[in-house]
């Protein structure tokens, strides 16, 4: 799988999007999990509503929320009040029975300062010999959410390494 890098600023909110084929994954619940090491399972953080038809309802686990646009085919995860320890490798998953398909691998980076965001020209992308075959960067700065406010999607640059 390609890996997408999402960068956010400590104390602010970050929105992660995972697009998927809505027909292929019709009727399937989704999940957001964290890979805590090179080996071992992906640790579930939050999953969509138990009733697939209600997947559009936002579900929270602590400061992490998930919502699914099943018609448009976009799973959205919001990390509120981002902290350094939220950084890590995550997966968006499509669930079927006890199995899970990976929709997207996501690397979340938490920066100390908005000025630490690099310009597109400064970003580095891994080559084929690196840990991931390909990288796709969503370079985002989000603002803090007011209570009950729906976060706006991050401004992003899309980069592909071939």
């Amino acid at each position: 799988h390609n890996t997408t890098v999402f960068q956010g600023v400590a104390g602010q909110s970050l929105q992660v999007s995972c697009p998927y084929d809505s027909m292929k994954h019709w009727g399937r619940r989704k999940a957001w999990c964290r890979q805590l090491g090179e080996k071992g399972p992906c640790q579930r953080v939050v999953s969509t509503h138990n009733l697939w038809l209600l997947s559009f309802l936002r579900r929270w686990n602590g400061s992490t929320a998930i919502t699914d646009d099943t018609l448009g085919g976009t799973l959205t995860i919001t990390l509120r009040n981002l902290q350094p320890h939220d950084a890590g490798l995550y997966q968006c998953q499509s669930l079927h029975g006890s199995e899970a398909d990976t929709l997207r691998k996501v690397l979340v980076e938490v920066l100390a300062d908005p000025l630490d965001h690099r310009d597109a020209g400064d970003l580095w992308f891994p080559g084929e010999s690196e840990s991931f075959e390909d990288a796709h960067v969503e370079h985002s700065i989000s603002r803090s959410l007011l209570e009950g406010e729906i976060p706006f999607p991050p401004t992003s640059h899309h980069h592909h390494h071939h």
């Epitope: 104390g11 902290q83 890590g88 891994p126």
Partner: antibody, heavy 121, light 107 residues
Framework: EVQLQESGPVLVKPGASVKMSCKAS????????MNWVKQSHGKSLEWIGV????????SYNQKFKGKATLTVDKSSSTAYMELNSLTSEDSAVYYC??????????????WGQGTLVTVSA | DIQMTQSPSSLSASLGERVSLTCRAS??????LSWLQQKPDGTIKRLIY???TLDSGVPKRFSGSRSGSDYSLTISSLESEDFADYYC?????????FGGGTKLEIK
């Protein structure tokens, strides 16, 4: 076995710059964050900043912004820290410390042996 | 910045004695705290992370605990190799900060 081998002690003149290295072995270099920490003589530790070797993204302690620059060379699994405009206040031992998997969510499990920097005319 | 107030700054104790060191966080750090040991040659080793999880290879006489904003490192029965400097580290938020250190000396 995880090892972080830091470069040797250096004596530099005030106003000069110094670039120290931390060569990592025993693990996949790009999978783990690398932190840098300062310890002035007889004092406690201060976190300087962190770099994600996979993307090159950095975060700095505001106190060291403009003083320290963190970089990596993935081909040699080496992290670097450059300190500029050196003064006697920069005389210290500097440590590299590996974080956890694409994060620092469990702190710094592995430490280098430290590089002594002495600033003197 | 989060201040980590470590006490005592120095401690004299005898072999076999039980000792406790404490770090108080000025803000909530939710257990994102580790304890480090620094030997006289400068070598630093992590003993405990996530407030109470013992690192592999660390003797069981070391333990970590939390009570509100107070975090403690306890050595149940001191051995000669335990005499060193100890630091707490919070990695909950930027900038990461260390306690002032405790010098543990032989009485």
């Amino acid at each position: 076995e995880v090892q972080l081998q830091e470069s040797g002690p250096v004596l530099v003149k005030p106003g000069a710059s110094v670039k120290m290295s931390c060569k990592a072995s025993g693990y996949t270099f790009t999978d783990y964050y690398m932190n840098w920490v300062k310890q002035s003589h007889g004092k406690s530790l201060e976190w300087i900043g962190v770099i994600n070797p996979y993307t090159g993204a950095t975060s700095y302690n505001q106190k060291f912004k403009g003083k320290a620059t963190l970089t990596v060379d993935k081909s040699s699994s080496t992290a670097y820290m450059e300190l500029n405009s050196l003064t006697s206040e920069d005389s210290a031992v500097y440590y590299c410390a590996r974080g956890t998997y694409y994060s620092n969510y469990e702190g710094f499990p592995y430490w280098g042996q430290g590089t002594l920097v002495t600033v003197s005319a | 910045d989060i201040q980590m107030t470590q006490s005592p700054s120095s401690l004299s104790a005898s072999l076999g004695e039980r000792v406790s060191l404490t770090c108080r966080a000025s803000q909530e750090i939710s257990g994102y705290l580790s304890w480090l040991q620094q030997k006289p040659d400068g070598t630093i080793k992590r003993l405990i992370y996530a407030a109470s999880t013992l690192d592999s290879g660390v003797p069981k006489r070391f333990s970590g605990s939390r009570s509100g904003s107070d975090y403690s490192l306890t050595i149940s029965s001191l051995e000669s190799e335990d005499f060193a400097d100890y630091y707490c580290l919070q990695y909950a938020s930027y900038p990461y900060t260390f306690g002032g250190g405790t010098k543990l000396e032989i009485k």
